[in-house]
């Protein structure tokens, strides 16, 4: 009886769209790497669905993912990081869909942190600095950062600056005086690894000073 139910489940499952996407995070917890996968369709019924990765692993043939609500997750030291792995969605031991992926091409860096902005009165500029955990990593060390800033009242008018360092200077003359600005930063692998933008850092807010008239100037 249960056999018939399982076959029925399988037939139903084969009609669904099980497209999924994954990203890796290297050395995310000491020397441990992580791999996170999720279905593209948020309405997929994930009951009884499992994810498994096989190939390009150290000491083991395959690894099963843990399910955390609607995402599937592995944290391990066992990724070889050379060659392609096969990632499959399975139900009752049968693969529904699979993807061959090199984990070094789907890297999502950790979000930058400690973003701050310091105004230099003498230089009439703002020095933007932030930190990234990737400076200490063995693998994904080279990143491109995207610094985005906007005047708080301009909801969708973000200005973007791409840079490889963790320091940026914004000239006061290019910003509105006496205005509140929001600034944030994210990172993407830039060399040796490929992948996706990190999450945005927490936003930092700063106010530009009023324009001081020089002595002797008329109002």
């Amino acid at each position: 009886e249960s056999g018939y139910a399982q076959n029925g489940d399988l037939e139903d499952a084969e009609l669904d769209d099980y497209s999924f996407s994954c990203y890796s995070q290297l050395e995310v917890n000491g020397s441990q790497h992580s791999l996170t996968c999720a279905f593209e369709d948020p309405d997929v019924n994930t009951t009884n669905l499992e994810f498994e990765i096989c190939g390009a692993l150290v000491e083991v043939k395959c690894l099963s993912f843990r399910k955390l609500q609607e995402i599937y997750f592995i944290e391990t030291k066992k990724f070889l990081l050379i060659g392609k792995s096969n990632i499959c969605v399975k139900v009752g031991g049968k693969s529904l869909t699979c993807k061959k992926i090199d984990l070094t091409t789907i890297v999502k860096p950790e979000a930058p942190f400690d973003l701050s902005v310091i105004y230099r009165e003498g230089a009439n500029d703002f020095v933007v600095t932030f930190n990234t955990s990737h400076l200490q990593k063995k693998y994904v060390k080279v990143l491109m950062h995207d610094v985005a800033y906007r005047q708080e009242k301009d909801e969708n008018k973000w200005m973007h600056v791409n840079l490889s360092s963790t320091k940026l200077t914004l000239l006061q003359r290019n910003l509105q005086p006496e205005a509140m600005y929001e600034i944030k930063v994210r990172s993407i692998p830039d060399h040796y690894f490929k992948g996706f933008w990190s999450e945005w850092s927490p936003s930092y807010y700063f106010r530009t000073p009023e324009i001081n008239n020089s002595p002797g100037e008329m109002d």
């Epitope: 050379i82 070094t104 091409t105 040796y192």
Partner: nanobody, 118 residues
Framework: DVQLVESGGGLVQAGGSLRLSCESS????????MGWFRQAPGKELEFLAA????????HYSDSVKGRFTISRDNAKNTVYLQMNSLRAEDTGRYYC???????????WGQGTQVTVSS
């Protein structure tokens, strides 16, 4: 039709060095993992070293770690194996392989002979 061609083998004295090259004509070279293997007379094929598509990640067998270095030049479609402090037991035919796909190397060269005399 030949897709992987090894070169650089030869006769060398113990303690000496050799640099093997493997040129690929496979269109996906710059996104493929590459590996080096050897087969000593009367022995099984032995994995030596592998390198990821960009060169950032390498992996070595314990038998060659610290003596051999794998590298690649994606502009030249070539992978190298620098072999230092060679020993008599390093004698064998050296093969390169391309595209490590779910634990199977998809393409293999014909090999180049390395002989280390003591």
């Amino acid at each position: 039709d030949v897709q992987l061609v090894e070169s650089g083998g030869g006769l060398v004295q113990a303690g000496g060095s050799l640099r093997l090259s493997c040129e690929s004509s496979i269109s996906t070279f710059s996104s493929d993992a590459m590996g080096w293997f050897r087969q000593a007379p009367g022995k099984e094929l032995e994995f030596l070293a592998a390198i990821g598509w960009s060169g950032a990640v390498t992996h070595y067998s314990d038998s060659v770690k610290g003596r051999f270095t794998i590298s690649r030049d994606n502009a030249k479609n070539t992978v190298y194996l620098q072999m230092n402090s060679l020993r008599a037991e390093d004698t064998g035919r050296y093969y390169c392989a391309e595209d490590y796909d779910t634990d199977v190397w998809q393409y293999w060269g014909q090999g180049t002979q390395v002989t280390v005399s003591s």
